[in-house]
């Protein structure tokens, strides 16, 4: 195939791949008709002048995972047809000025996972056709004004995993075509007002895992096309009332792992496409009326691992589409009987690891489709008569780790549980806490020396013994098992998406096995 170097493989499709530690320089002669060249996992440490001079038809060049630390300015001379250039996963600390000169067709430039300390406006001033620039995983501490001014066609810019401590409000001003901007895993403490104003076509903005404390009220007001906004794992303590008001296209918003103490009513301005909202691991103490009322299409709401002690009766107004509600691991002592009344389509609710002492008899009155209720590890001594009677689809109910008071008043509950044992699961059953003579005995089989009043019990639906939600030990008590989501180790991937993060937290989802796929 027009002379393929012995250390490379060449295909009929004009593709050349050179790999292996024995390669210490760009192999020669390369086939003159090569259109794609990959140099991977070699011991090449430098690129000298014009090593690709005779392959001017090259369209894609990948020089990745090498020992490359030095490049001569003319290394890519004569590659005017090149559209894709990757120098990712090398050891570059410095880019020579003019390195990309003459690469008039270049559309994608990948410089990620190197050791670059700085970039300058002159580096990319010739790259007027560039659409994608990947700079993540370097050691950049600041971006000078003008660095991207010539990249007017850029649609994707990744600056994640650097050491940026601040961003100039002018640095992105000419990037009107940018669709994706990633600044995750830096050291940003604030974002100046106006920073994103020129980004009218922005669809994704990744700011997670920084140290951002405050958001300017109008920070996103020009980003009407924004679909995904990642703000999780920062230090955000409050949300300006209008900060999310101009984001009608938003379908992903992550705010978990911040320091939010309160949410003002209507803070989540009309977002008709938002289907999941993850707010776990904040410091939220109460939920006022109508706080989520603009989120008419929300299906999943995760509020676990906060400090919520009060929920206003109208807090969940408007959430007519909600299927899953996670409130576990909070400080709830009481719930208003009407708090869930508007959640007609709710299937799963997790309330475990709170301080609930009692539940109103009508707490689930309008939530007829409930399939799973997590109530373990609270302070419940009894439950009102008939609280679950209308829940014909209920197939998972977790009641263990509560201080059940096994006197004569417990009989109606005991009898209902006796007839509905499959719904309780097999892992851990509720046991009596008092009186002392029956402590530790199963609530279901306890013999209470009183006449058993007749109790109407509904027929148990023939549902699987354990429903089908996420499976995992319940946080924080890893000794007893509830079926919640399997969370394992922290994820190092850059996007945190609308999910949990976590080192060894064993449950954020906190649902069980009854929800839908």
């Amino acid at each position: 195939y027009h002379g393929c170097p012995s250390e490379c493989t060449c295909s009929r499709a004009s593709q050349v791949e050179c790999t292996g530690a024995r390669i210490v320089a760009v192999p020669t002669p390369l086939p003159w008709n090569a259109m794609s060249l990959q140099i991977l996992n070699t011991h090449i440490t430098e690129l000298n002048e014009s090593p690709f001079l005779n392959i001017s038809a090259l369209i894609a060049l990948r020089i990745e995972k090498n020992e490359l630390s030095r490049i001569t300015p003319g290394a890519f001379r004569n590659l005017g047809s090149l559209r894709y250039l990757s120098l990712a996963n090398n050891k570059l600390q410095v880019l020579p000025i003019g390195l990309f000169q003459g690469l008039d067709s270049l559309e994608s430039l990948l410089l990620s996972s190197n050791q670059l300390l700085q970039i300058q406006p002159a580096h990319f001033s010739q790259c007027s056709n560039l659409k994608e620039l990947q700079l993540h995983g370097n050691h950049l501490e600041y971006i000078p004004d003008g660095a991207f001014d010539h990249l007017v066609g850029l649609t994707k810019l990744n600056l994640g995993k650097n050491s940026l401590t601040h961003i100039s409000p002018r640095v992105f001003q000419h990037l009107g075509n940018l669709q994706v901007l990633r600044l995750y895993e830096n050291r940003l403490t604030d974002i100046p007002m106006g920073t994103f104003d020129g980004l009218v076509n922005l669809q994704e903005l990744a700011l997670q895992q920084n140290q951002i404390g405050l958001l300017s009220p109008g920070l996103f007001h020009n980003n009407h096309n924004l679909q995904r906004l990642y703000l999780s794992n920062n230090h955000i303590s409050q949300l300006p009332p209008s900060v999310f008001m101009q984001l009608p296209q938003l379908n992903r918003l992550t705010l978990f792992g911040n320091s939010l103490k309160e949410l003002s009513p209507g803070i989540f301005g009309p977002m008709p496409n938002l289907r999941e909202l993850w707010l776990y691991d904040n410091h939220i103490s109460s939920l006022p009326d109508n706080v989520f009322s603009n989120l008419r299409q929300l299906q999943v709401l995760i509020l676990s691992r906060n400090q919520i002690s009060f929920i206003s009766p109208g807090a969940f107004n408007g959430l007519t589409e909600l299927r899953e509600l996670s409130l576990h691991t909070n400080a709830l002592q009481d719930l208003d009987g009407n708090v869930f009344r508007m959640l007609a389509n709710l299937q799963n609710i997790s309330l475990q690891n709170n301080r609930l002492r009692q539940l109103p008899g009508n707490i689930f009155a309008n939530v007829n489709g409930l399939m799973a209720i997590q109530l373990q590890n609270n302070q419940l001594e009894n439950l009102p008569l008939g609280i679950f009677d209308h829940l014909g689809k209920l197939c998972e109910l977790r009641l263990y780790d509560n201080p059940w008071r096994c006197d004569s008043d417990i009989l109606p509950l005991r009898n209902w549980l006796l007839l509905n044992q499959p719904r309780l699961g097999t892992d851990t059953v509720p046991v009596c806490f008092s009186p002392a003579n029956v402590r530790g005995q199963s609530l279901i089989i306890i013999n209470v020396n009183v006449a058993v009043p007749s109790v109407h019990v509904p027929e148990v639906p023939s549902y699987p013994e354990t429903p089908w939600y996420p499976d995992t030990p319940s946080y924080p008590d890893t000794t007893s098992v509830s079926s919640t989501t399997e969370l394992t180790s922290p994820v190092e991937d850059y996007t945190d998406l609308t999910t949990i993060q976590v080192t060894d937290d064993r449950s954020v989802w906190g649902m069980t096995q009854a929800q839908s796929g």
Partner: antibody
């Protein structure tokens, strides 16, 4: 371009295990749910379960609990499904598929992996 | 589990003619806003391809001769003018509870 590329066909003995991979590219792997679906020869489709890569959270169809184990490796943007204690009725094509939100449809599918269980 | 019953099992339609496939759920899969019903097309040797999501929303890149309708328990996939490339098996799927699929409807050219 969004792609889900699955591992090649497998022939296994009854009682053994198989691990099928699904390599994702062209999208942010941790931002989507990955579903697994079974299609036995000449049969319809059967949902096995899903995994949410960022939290490694899973949901299973009760029927496949204990049979299938779903995992992910976010560093390589790959999802895995391991099937244990294989029997002849596990012979099928297994698909991975992507979903944007938990209750959304599956908008991109892998090409499928044929697993044949035969002594 | 929710059972989805598709009808007919197979369907032969002339090129350019309308094809209609029905899917009935054993219980409602709709709210006031959404129906949690989706439609897929599967050609021999290929994976399923999403056509319609949430009962009536056409997936990006799918020809507009495909349309979906219905709510509650009864849903319909319509191909307004059958083309040769539409020969396939069509499946409905619900995501209201544990996901289940219909048995499939084979569409052929008459």
């Amino acid at each position: 371009e969004v792609q889900l590329v699955q591992s090649g066909a497998e022939v296994k003995k009854p009682g053994s295990s198989v691990k099928v991979s699904c390599k994702a590219s062209g999208f942010t792997f941790t931002d989507y749910y990955i579903h697994w679906v079974k299609q036995a020869p000449g049969q319809g489709l059967e949902w096995i379960g899903l995994v949410y890569p960022y939290i490694h959270g899973t949901n299973y169809n009760q029927k496949f609990k204990g049979k299938a184990t779903l995992t992910v490796d976010t560093s390589t943007t790959t999802a895995y499904m391991e099937m244990s204690s294989l029997r002849s009725e596990d012979t099928a094509v297994y698909y991975c598929a992507r979903g944007d939100n938990k209750y959304d449809a599956m908008d991109y599918w892998g090409q499928g992996t044929t697993v044949t269980v035969s002594s | 589990d929710i059972v989805l019953t598709q009808s007919p099992d197979s369907l032969a339609v002339s090129l350019g003619e309308r094809a209609t496939i029905n899917c009935r759920a054993s219980q409602s899969v709709s709210t006031s806003s959404y129906s949690y019903m989706h439609w897929y097309q599967q050609k021999p040797g290929q994976p399923p391809k999403l056509l319609i999501k949430y009962a009536s929303s056409l997936e990006s890149g799918v020809p507009d001769r495909f349309s979906g309708s219905g709510s509650g328990t009864d849903f319909t996939l319509t191909i307004s003018s059958l083309q040769a490339e539409d020969v396939a098996v069509y499946y409905c799927e619900q995501s209201w509870e544990i996901r289940t699929f219909g048995g499939g409807t084979k569409v052929e050219i008459k």
